[in-house]
Amino acid sequence: VEIYTSRVLEAVNGTDARLKCTFSSFAPVGDALTVTWNFRPLDGGPEQFVFYYHIDPFQPMSGRFKDRVSWDGNPERYDASILLWKLQFDDNGTYTCQVKNPPDVDGVIGEIRLSVVHTVRFSEIHFL
């Protein structure tokens, strides 16, 4: 499995962000596919569970991401993206996307460095 992410993402406090993660695999996508999203905070604290997908999407039942994350992927299109709502400044950090698609071997975990800012920089307005 090979994973592709946007690497760096800047988003405005209070808005929603799509954390894009796509993948390729020599094995067909089926019921064995799993996607795990985790979060490493900037302060170096323990990694946190964000989201899990296996046949169905599953939000965390506890913690900072409870009721703030949803599935925005499409496995048939090799898309494992999620939506993170109501961004806060302490959402700053690294989000990891891990895709397993047996019998394909696990690949390198994808990473997105999210920066939550007060206002978007002018140079990035055309991306919105």
């Epitope: 799993t34 795990t36 985790n38 905070p41 302060d43 604290g45 323990p46 990694e47 946190q48 569970f49 899990y52 296996h54 169905d56 599953f58 039942m61 506890s62 913690g63 900072r64 302490d90 397993k100």
Partner: antibody, heavy 116, light 106 residues
Framework: QVQLVQSGSELKKPGASVKVSCKAS????????MHWVRQAPGQGLEWMGE????????DYNEGFTGRFVFSVDKSVSTAYLQISSLKAEDTAVYYC?????????WGQGTLVTVSS | DIQLTQSPSFLSASVGDRVTITCRAS?????MYWYQQKPGKAPKPLIY???NLASGVPSRFSGSGSGTEYTLTISSLQPEDFATYYC?????????FGQGTKLEIK
Amino acid sequence: QVQLVQSGSELKKPGASVKVSCKASGYTFTNYWMHWVRQAPGQGLEWMGEINPTNGGTDYNEGFTGRFVFSVDKSVSTAYLQISSLKAEDTAVYYCTIYTTALDYWGQGTLVTVSS
Amino acid sequence: DIQLTQSPSFLSASVGDRVTITCRASSSVGYMYWYQQKPGKAPKPLIYVTSNLASGVPSRFSGSGSGTEYTLTISSLQPEDFATYYCQQWSSNPPTFGQGTKLEIK
């Protein structure tokens, strides 16, 4: 490194109250919800509930409402479990634990013994 | 509440053995956690969300499953693996634990 240090063992009489503390260090206290788990002697694990240290919001498991109260003091990065009107069946080890990718970090446990 | 039933409840095995513990849920759950507990100690996480190894856990431990049936496998038992193992679901509130599987030296 992350540490959760709980207060020492308690021996209480039925009807009394007890307050167990859990002092957190090595991480940002408000970033992780604190959970409480009970283990009666020789028995399995039972999730009691959780508290959000940021705003004090709580979620209690059925069976742990009324006599059980979770609280936090952010200024000293400490969570508390208070049990009132103690009964013999409250005799157990009480653990605090934080949810990260799982219940990854645990206190050493506090044995509360209720006996007349 | 979702009930988790582990089998077996007790298991005798020898160093080097391959061991599998099963956890069955009363209704479908999305993922499973596994913990190891030694006498007088707090539980230690082994597996999170079904198949991911917790930090510092040796690769001889693995998890799998879906729906109502999940398994924890230890590929080659080591002396330090003799303990009690618990499964836990948290894809539905409240989180619940299995009754435990005590793994003893044969």
